[in-house]
């Protein structure tokens, strides 16, 4: 359909709190330093204006593409060049490099202080104007976040506003709100980290890429759907986060509605798990339908070989309809495997694809594809063996331990790679233990593989801002369904030279003691990694003992009655006691 | 589903023509994989020919190529085989059969075919 007014058909679809909320975190997205009032008083304008284009529109700029407004609000600020730089460049290109160049611009590790919840402060701001409130949540977590899944972060700010009308009623606010606020935190991280690496593949990998990865994971969930149904449902899909990764968030979110709307008419021939999520309102059952349970597998699913190897025309329908005939391999493959990682099932088709195109070239193809399924099985041996090897590692140390050791591990492989960065991605990495290998053996897989796929994009988004080791670039960009055993194939960098020993680094104080739980974790286990670039080739026994001497002078500083003189008088003799441990 | 309803079969003398019509109700034809199968008096049912859903593909048994064409007409969501220069040996109850969803013919065993119509018998005789 063709509007005369792309934002008044925008703002009429999707209603002014919605228009509002999507604008806010457009806008947030980009400029991720800007205070919350200048970005309210952003969305104020443009809501004005999109409510001129709704009464009449024809009224002057109302023709304009949404990218252009958008661009010209932002390049209209005044301190543009002062607060972001060359950010402030891309306002001297046209339409659609300008919005191309904001993009490059975001920036996925924000110098902004992490959110500390104050029970009482909130409940306050929250009774005294809920609005505000809802904004600002929307806004502190689309800075941080600039390729959060828009629609979605709307839903979880009204569930956020929910906790907040629950626990603000309560006589132990903190004891109501902490926990509930720890758990959505969770969720959100878990969701922005699902969303980069949808946004990673459609831009470094492309729109096929995160076809395949959408056939894979659809297919698994909606086992009883048919090839047709799964496809036309990943065309849409692939639309809306092209949109959401591309900033266009009021078509993407307009596209999700669609979507949603499309799927709950036919679920029928889609899901017997949709039921309940058809009869919630819009956000929630487009949250819903994204987390819908599997279905159960239809009961008289055929052998696979009979169509994939047995029969004759395999290779017409390679040479004939490559995407489609490899799609609806990787669509029967998956629905028949909902206890594989999107990961496995992909490296599953990609040598589904590879043996074609060397077999279907030969006299005989048919004799020459006999055997390919039984290529898949050191495939599937592999993650499930490093599964076992590392839940049992997990098994023994517990979380902090496990973390530790792969803190180690990837030091060792990728010492270049800065130490925030590997003491945040091994961190998240030693996650997966507590995530995921309680579960079931057969959920083991799925769960261990996509979450390290998340952890691991992580890893590539930051350092493709700073590209410090060969290594790390080539398990990033090669393939992004092997990023993982790309990684997990790495050895120590016997190239590496070791830094210097810094003083400074090892050098703590007083504030260590009244340090959450975690933080002080961190602040160990970045002294572990500082440890380890400058002696690579540190046993374990020593690690151990400088981890225990650590732990011990820790322990002693923060229980004697003067915290900093501790440190201060201590500290020195701990840096020596380390370097004779080490030499 | 899918309901299929097989027209134009009948007798017809060895060199001459038929076109057998497949009426598809429940489900558009152009998303379904559909296909022709015969079966003689005493055997099996055989592949003749099919075409891809969504996907114009068409595929043919050894024994018709060249002989057989298979087509269908979406505004009337139908399909179609002419078959042209006909043998005794083409005689037997000639089968439309559906796999919904299914891009691409990927087997030619009956089996995997879930709808079927109740067929049109062809007999080539002089």
């Known amino acids: 359909d063709t509007y005369k007014s792309e934002i008044a058909h925008r703002f009429k679809d999707l209603g002014e709190q919605y228009f509002k909320g999507l604008v806010l975190i457009a806008f947030s997205q980009h400029l991720q330093q800007c205070p919350y009032e200048e970005h309210v008083k952003l969305v104020r304008e443009v809501t004005e204006f999109a409510k001129t284009c709704v009464a009449d529109e024809s009224a002057e700029n109302c023709d304009k593409s949404i990218h252009t407004l958008f661009g010209d609000k932002l390049c209209a600020i005044p301190s543009l060049r002062e607060h972001y730089g060359d950010l402030a460049d891309c306002c001297e290109k046209e339409e659609p490099e300008r919005n191309e160049c904001f993009l490059q611009h975001k920036n996925d590790n924000p110098d902004i202080p992490k959110l500390k919840p104050d029970p009482v402060a909130l409940c306050a701001d929250f009774q005294e104007d809920e609005q505000k409130f809802w904004g600002k949540y929307l806004y502190e977590i689309a800075r941080r976040h600039p390729y959060f899944y828009a629609p979605e972060l709307l839903y979880y700010a009204i569930i956020y506003k929910d906790v907040f009308s629950e626990c603000c009623q309560a006589a132990d606010k903190a004891a109501c709100l902490l926990p509930k606020i720890e758990h959505l935190r969770e969720k959100v991280l878990t969701s922005a980290a699902k969303q980069r690496l949808k946004c990673a593949s459609i831009q470094k990998f492309g729109e096929r890429a995160f076809k395949a990865w959408s056939l894979a994971r659809l297919s698994q969930r909606f086992p009883k759907a048919d090839f047709t149904e799964i496809s036309k449902i990943v065309t849409d899909l692939a639309k809306v986060h092209k949109e959401c990764c591309h900033g266009d968030l009021l078509e993407c979110a307009d596209d999700r509605a669609d979507l949603a709307k499309y799927i709950c008419e036919n679920q029928d021939t889609i899901s017997t798990k949709l039921k309940e999520c058809c009869d919630k309102p819009l956000l929630e059952k487009s949250h819903c339908i994204a987390e819908a349970k599997r279905d159960e597998l239809p009961a008289d699913l055929n052998p696979l070989e009979h169509d994939f190897v047995e029969d004759k025309e395999v290779c017409k329908n390679y040479k004939e309809a490559k995407h489609v005939f490899l799609g609806t391999f990787l669509y029967e493959y998956s629905r028949r495997h909902p206890d594989y990682s999107v990961s496995l099932l992909l490296r599953i088709a990609k040598i589904y694809e590879a043996t074609l195109e060397d077999c279907c070239a030969k006299e005989d193809p048919p004799a020459c594809y006999a055997t390919v399924f039984d290529k898949f099985q050191p495939l599937v041996d592999e993650p499930k063996n490093l599964i076992k090897q590392n839940c049992e590692l997990f098994e023994k140390l517990g979380e902090y331990g496990f973390q530790n050791a792969l803190i180690v591990r990837y030091t060792k492989k990728v010492p270049q790679v800065s130490t925030p960065t590997l003491v945040e991605v091994a961190r998240k990495l030693g996650l997966v233990g507590s995530r995921c290998c309680k579960r079931p053996e057969e959920e083991r897989l799925s769960c261990a593989e996509d979450y390290l796929s998340l952890v691991l994009n992580r890893l590539c988004v930051l350092h493709e801002k700073t590209p410090v080791s060969e290594k790390v670039t080539k398990c990033c960009t090669e393939s992004l369904v092997n990023r993982r055993p790309c990684f997990s194939a790495l050895t120590p960098d016997e190239t590496y030279k070791p830094k210097e020993f810094v003083e400074g680094t090892f050098t703590f104080h007083a504030d260590l003691c009244t340090l959450p739980e975690d933080e002080k974790q961190i602040k160990k286990q970045t002294a572990l990694v500082e440890l380890l670039k400058h002696k690579p080739h540190a046993t374990e026994e020593q690690l151990r003992t400088v981890l225990g001497n650590f732990a011990a002078f820790v322990q002693k500083c923060c229980a004697a009655p003067d915290h900093e003189a501790c440190f201060a008088v201590e500290g020195p003799k701990f840096v020596i006691e380390i370097r004779g441990i080490l030499a | 589903e899918v309901q299929l309803l097989e027209s134009g079969g009948g007798l017809v003398q060895p060199g001459g023509s038929l076109r057998l019509s497949c009426a598809a109700s429940g489900r558009y034809i152009d998303e379904t994989a559909v296909a022709w199968f015969r079966q003689a008096p005493g055997k099996g049912r055989e592949f003749v020919a099919g075409i891809g859903g969504g996907v114009d593909i068409t595929y043919y048994a050894d024994s018709v190529k060249g002989r057989f064409t298979i087509s269908r007409d979406n505004s009337k969501n139908t399909l179609y085989l002419q078959m042209n220069s006909l043998r005794p040996e083409d005689t037997a109850v000639y089968y439309c059969?559906?796999?919904?969803?299914?891009?691409?013919?990927?087997?030619?065993?009956?089996?995997?075919?879930?709808?079927w119509g109740q067929g049109t018998l062809v007999t080539v005789s002089s």
């Open positions: 059969g559906a796999r919904p969803g299914r891009p691409l013919i990927t087997s030619k065993v009956a089996d995997l075919y879930p709808y």
